[in-house]
C-alpha cells in the first residue's frame, strides 16, 4: 500500500547532502566515497545490498588505485580474527579489525565500525570500475565469518540517531560511458536514513521483507508485455528473490529465464536476434539513434504487497534490461547487451531493476518500496511503471522455504 | 587498442596435453566472452567454445567437448585453453577471438604440431 | 549445425574490378552473417557484421548485402593488398560455423 502517512522524525523529504553521491556504471556497480581510520583515508566502496561484510582492499593489487593503510590509522584495532570469503567465482581473504568510519556525502556522523582488510583476493577487484572496497548492507545473519560480526549499517544505526532505513537511486546512463565520463558522471543517490522525495514520481509501494538476511522478497506474478507466464509462482521465487545493487543483471531461475525468453523473443520477432543474445555472448547494434525500443517488450514483476492479498507491480523497459556496451569495433552504432540471465539460486533483482526506480530500504518496518526513478531512462512512448493495488490470493505459498541443513532436521 | 596476444608456438608429442593462452588487453576484459577456434590447411575454421570472463561460463562445440578445456584468470585478463590426448588430427592453428557482434578481434595464432 | 556454402573456392580478378563473393547457409540465419579476410600466415580480419554493416576502419569498397540463406561480399575498385582468402561465418546458431573459403587472386 503507499506509504502517504505522517513522515516519522529523520524522514524529511530532502537530503541534499547526499544526492549525487554515487557514481559509476551498472556493469561494474555503484559506489559511494568513504573515509576510514584517523586521519581519513579515503576510499570508493561499491555499494552492495547483497552482502553484509564491509570489506576494503588493504594491499597492493593491480587494479587498485589506492587501498586502506592499517598502519597510518591510530584508531584502527585489530581484532586477530581472519575472514575468508569464497563466491562462486572467486573470493577475497582478509583481516578483521575495527576503525572509525564516515561517509562525506552522508549522515555528518563517525561510526566504529567492523572492517574486513583484504590482503588476497581473486576475480573479486574489477580493472576500471575505480571502487576499492564493498559497503555490505545486507543483514547479519549473512555476514562472514558469521552472524557475530555486527555490519555497518547496523553499527551506524547504533551508535548514532540515523533512521534504521535507507535508500538508492540508481541512474543508468541509457549509453556507454568511457572511463573519463564514469569519473565526471553522476551514478545516483544513497540516502541513508531517510526518503528524498525529489528522486521519484508517484507513489511509494512496500513490500515485505520475508526474512532479514538477504534483502528477500516475494514475486507473486510476472508479466512480458501484459502476458502472465503463467508458471507456478513458487518458480519465482526458486530458491529465493533478493535485491541486489551489488549484481547488474536480473537474473532469473533457469525456467523462469527460459520461459521469459521465450516470450521475449516471440514480442521481439520482427528482427531475428542471434542464439547468443540471449546468453548475453552477443551484442546487437543498430545504427546510433535508431534503436527500435518499441519491438521489445515490458516487463512486469508483482511483488507481494502489505496487506492480505494485495499486490502492486513494478514494470521495466527495454531500456532497462538492454545494457548499453561500447566496443571500438562497432563505435558507429549502438549496441547492447542483454541483461537478464540464468540464475541457480534465485531470482536477483540487479541494477537491470534498480535502475528504474527509487528503492527504499524500510528496515525499521521490514519492508522495500519501490517508486519510479526521477533518473530512469524511458523514451516518448513507455515509462517505467509502480502500480496497484491487485487482488492476488495464497501469495504466502510463493515462497520457497529452503531445506535446512543442520543435523537436527535430518532424518537418521 | 583491443589487442589479444597468444602464446608461442608448441611441438607436443602424441598423448601428451598442452595450454595455449590469450592474453586480453584494451578493453574491459570481463564485458566480451572469448572465442577459441581451429583451422587446420583445407579444413577451414572451426569453433571450438566460448568462455564468460565475468563467471567462467562455458559453452563447447559438441565436436571438441572431450579435447578442450577453457579457463580464465581475471586478474591477469587471460584465458587459457587445455587441449588433452593430442594426436595428429590435433595439429592445427589455434586461435583465441573475442566477442561483440561476431569476432570483431583475434589473437596473432598459436601454433600446435603434434609429432613423436 | 549450420553449414556455410562457399561454391567457388577461387575468383580470379583485375585491380580495380568489382568482384562478389557469395555464401550460402543450410538454414534461415536472419542477418547473423559475418565476413573475414584473412592473408596468407596471418589472422582474420573482420570485415561485415550483421550481413552489412562494416566494422569501424574497414575502406567502403567492401560491402555486404543478403538476408535469410544468401549472402555476398562485395569489393569494388579491388586493390592489389585485397589479395586473400574471404571466409563467411553464421552466429544465428551455436555452433558458430565458418564457410570453406574463397581465394582472390590478382591477375
Known amino acids: 500500500e503507499t506509504d502517504e502517512e505522517p513522515e516519522e522524525p529523520g524522514r524529511r523529504g530532502s537530503f541534499v547532502e547526499m544526492v549525487d553521491n554515487l557514481r559509476g556504471k551498472s556493469g561494474q556497480g555503484y559506489y559511494v566515497e568513504m573515509t576510514v581510520g584517523s586521519p581519513p583515508q579515503t576510499l570508493n566502496i561499491l555499494v552492495d545490498t547483497g552482502s553484509s561484510n564491509f570489506a576494503v582492499g588493504a594491499a597492493p593489487h593491480p587494479f587498485l588505485h589506492r587501498y586502506y593503510q592499517r598502519q597510518l590509522s591510530s584508531t584502527y584495532r585489530d581484532l586477530r580474527k581472519g575472514v575468508y570469503v569464497p563466491y562462486t567465482q572467486g573470493k577475497w581473504e582478509g583481516e578483521l579489525g575495527t576503525d572509525l568510519v564516515s561517509i562525506p556525502h552522508g549522515p555528518n556522523v563517525t561510526v566504529r565500525a567492523n572492517i574486513a582488510a583484504i590482503t588476497e583476493s581473486d576475480k573479486f577487484f574489477i580493472n576500471g570500475s575505480n571502487w576499492e572496497g564493498i559497503l555490505g548492507l545486507a543483514y547479519a545473519e549473512i555476514a562472514r565469518p558469521d552472524d557475530s560480526l555486527e555490519p555497518f549499517f547496523d553499527s551506524l544505526v547504533k551508535q548514532t540517531h540515523v533512521p534504521n532505513l535507507f535508500s538508492l537511486q540508481l541512474c543508468g546512463a541509457g549509453f556507454p560511458l568511457n572511463q573519463s565520463e564514469v569519473l565526471a558522471s553522476v551514478g545516483g543517490s544513497m540516502i541513508i536514513g531517510g526518503i528524498d522525495h525529489s528522486l521519484y514520481t508517484g507513489s511509494l509501494w512496500y513490500t515485505p521483507i520475508r526474512r532479514e538476511w538477504y534483502y528477500e522478497v516475494i514475486i507473486v506474478r510476472v508479466e512480458i508485455n501484459g502476458q502472465d507466464l503463467k508458471m507456478d509462482c513458487k518458480e519465482y521465487n526458486y530458491d529465493k528473490s533478493i535485491v541486489d545493487s551489488g549484481t547488474t543483471n536480473l537474473r532469473l531461475p533457469k525456467k523462469v529465464f527460459e520461459a521469459a525468453v521465450k516470450s521475449i523473443k516471440a514480442a521481439s520477432s520482427t528482427e531475428k536476434f542471434p542464439d547468443g543474445f540471449w546468453l548475453g555472448e552477443q551484442l546487437v547494434c543498430w545504427q546510433a539513434g535508431t534503436t527500435p525500443w518499441n519491438i521489445f517488450p515490458v516487463i512486469s514483476l508483482y511483488l507481494m504487497g502489505e496487506v492480505t492479498n494485495q499486490s502492486f507491480r513494478i514494470t521495466i523497459l527495454p531500456q532497462q534490461y538492454l545494457r548499453p556496451v561500447e566496443d571500438v569495433a562497432t563505435s558507429q552504432d549502438d549496441c547492447y547487451k542483454f541483461a537478464i540471465s540464468q540464475s541457480s539460486t534465485g531470482t536477483v533483482m540487479g541494477a537491470v531493476i534498480m535502475e528504474g526506480f527509487y528503492v527504499v530500504f524500510d528496515r525499521a518496518r521490514k519492508r522495500i518500496g519501490f517508486a519510479v526513478s526521477a533518473c530512469h531512462v524511458h523514451d516518448e512512448f513507455r515509462t517505467a511503471a509502480v502500480e496497484g493495488p491487485f487482488v492476488t490470493l495464497d501469495m504466502e505459498d510463493c515462497g520457497y522455504n529452503i531445506p535446512q541443513t543442520d543435523e537436527s532436521t535430518l532424518m537418521t | 587498442e583491443v589487442q589479444l596476444q597468444q602464446s608461442g608456438p608448441e611441438l607436443v608429442k602424441p598423448g601428451a596435453s598442452v595450454k595455449l593462452s590469450c592474453k586480453a588487453s584494451?578493453?574491459?576484459?570481463?564485458n566480451f566472452w572469448i572465442h577459441w577456434l581451429k583451422q587446420r590447411p583445407g579444413q577451414g575454421l572451426e569453433w571450438?567454445?566460448?568462455?564468460?570472463?565475468?563467471?567462467?561460463?562455458?559453452k563447447y562445440n559438441q565436436k571438441f567437448k572431450a579435447k578442450a578445456t577453457l579457463t580464465v584468470d581475471t586478474s591477469s585478463s587471460t584465458t587459457y585453453m587445455h587441449l588433452s590426448s593430442l594426436t595428429s588430427e590435433d595439429s592445427a592453428v589455434y586461435y583465441c577471438?573475442?566477442?561483440?557482434?561476431?569476432?570483431?578481434?583475434w589473437g596473432q595464432r598459436t601454433l600446435v604440431t603434434v609429432s613423436a | 549445425d549450420i553449414v556455410m556454402t562457399q561454391s567457388q573456392k577461387f575468383m580470379s580478378t583485375s585491380v580495380g574490378d568489382r568482384v562478389s563473393v557469395t555464401c550460402k547457409a543450410s538454414?534461415?540465419?536472419?542477418?547473423?552473417v559475418a565476413w573475414y579476410q584473412q592473408k596468407s600466415g596471418q589472422s582474420p580480419k573482420a570485415l561485415i557484421y550483421?550481413?552489412?554493416h562494416r566494422y569501424s576502419g574497414v575502406p567502403d569498397r567492401f560491402t555486404g548485402s543478403g538476408s535469410g540463406t544468401d549472402f555476398t561480399l562485395t569489393i569494388s575498385n579491388v586493390q592489389s593488398e585485397d589479395l586473400a582468402e574471404y571466409f563467411c561465418?553464421?552466429?544465428?546458431?551455436?555452433?558458430?560455423?565458418f564457410g570453406g573459403g574463397t581465394k582472390l587472386e590478382i591477375k
Open positions: 577471438a573475442r566477442s561483440g557482434v561476431a569476432f570483431p578481434y
Open positions: 584494451g578493453y574491459t576484459f570481463t
Open positions: 571450438i567454445g566460448m568462455i564468460d570472463p565475468s563467471d567462467s561460463y562455458t
Open positions: 538454414q534461415n540465419v536472419g542477418t547473423n
Open positions: 550483421s550481413a552489412s
Open positions: 561465418q553464421q552466429y544465428n546458431s551455436y555452433p558458430y560455423t
